[in-house]
Amino acid sequence: YDFTNCDFEKIKAAYLSTISKDLITYMSGTKSTEFNNTVSCSNRPHCLTEIQSLTFNPTAGCASLAKEMFAMKTKAALAIWCPGYSETQINATQAMKKRRKRKVTTNKCLEQVSQLQGLWRRFNRPLLKQQ
């Protein structure tokens, strides 16, 4: 999906009002020095592409993020504020339902959500010129 035509300000508002708090709740109890962000993004469409991938694509050691509160709110925000996004996700959602697993918060998931926090922060401030 091409995120170029999303309403970025509306997504930013959804992030600040709800998604950010759910991410903090998920990460509560972890040390602020525990994880090192290795994923970055350079502009808002790029940030949303990375956020979508990390939130909804199962990875080795962390298959369960899509059912978390922050993920459901992310999905809702993208569906509302990105034209045509929900249509592109129908097949992906059906495939995900087939492989749904019990929610387990692993260290790998915590690391992944730490990466997501960094991506969302960069989405929130997409104002930087590369030196």
């Epitope: 992030y15 903090i24 969302w120 929130n124 930087l128």
Partner: antibody, heavy 119, light 107 residues
Framework: EVQLVQSGAEVKKPGASVKVSCKAS????????IDWVRQAPGQGLEWIGV????????NFNEKFKGRVTMTRDTSTSTAYMELSSLRSEDTAVYFC????????????WGQGTLVTVSS | DIQMTQSPSSLSASVGDRVTISCRAS??????LNWYQQKPGKAPKLLIY???TLHSGVPSRFSGSGSGTDYTLTISSLQPEDIATYFC?????????FGQGTKLEIK
Amino acid sequence: EVQLVQSGAEVKKPGASVKVSCKASGYTFTNYFIDWVRQAPGQGLEWIGVIDAFSGGSNFNEKFKGRVTMTRDTSTSTAYMELSSLRSEDTAVYFCARESEVGEGFAYWGQGTLVTVSS
Amino acid sequence: DIQMTQSPSSLSASVGDRVTISCRASQDISNYLNWYQQKPGKAPKLLIYYTSTLHSGVPSRFSGSGSGTDYTLTISSLQPEDIATYFCQQGNTLPYTFGQGTKLEIK
């Protein structure tokens, strides 16, 4: 505990440059942006600019165009702000500040570095 | 640049009083409004971000509200340790800009 420790006070002559450092600890340095803000004696706050500690990307207040350079050293978790062509009105306390967890607002501040510009 | 205007510039109140400080932006800042507290010789402290979200560790007697161009910081019951200068800051548009400050004193 998040801490930002800045370099000591500086006295500079007009036309000179100053480089202020900001050493971060208590969090993963490259995960956050660092902003620079100054405060002239008895005055309000003025935003200078911001650097992404991960990429080194930066942006700054156009007021300081051509005079400010922001850099960082990830090996020492230190951010730097250099201001050149100093004039008397640059006399101020210079603060570094880290963004909040959500990227909105300046949540953690250094203790400030007094830069005095005087002939 | 967006101009931020605070009122009043100074304020005297008694312990236990409800105190409100106003901040007006020269254009709509879409709720990207933060509040800071600064005590003499110290760095500012973030109190509230995005108009009304309390930063971690900030007492619940502090609250924020507003929209568009007009925003308010409220202290529901003034405590002696709240004596400080308060600044608003807009985070909507670069360059970020601050209000001139409101100095709060005890009667």
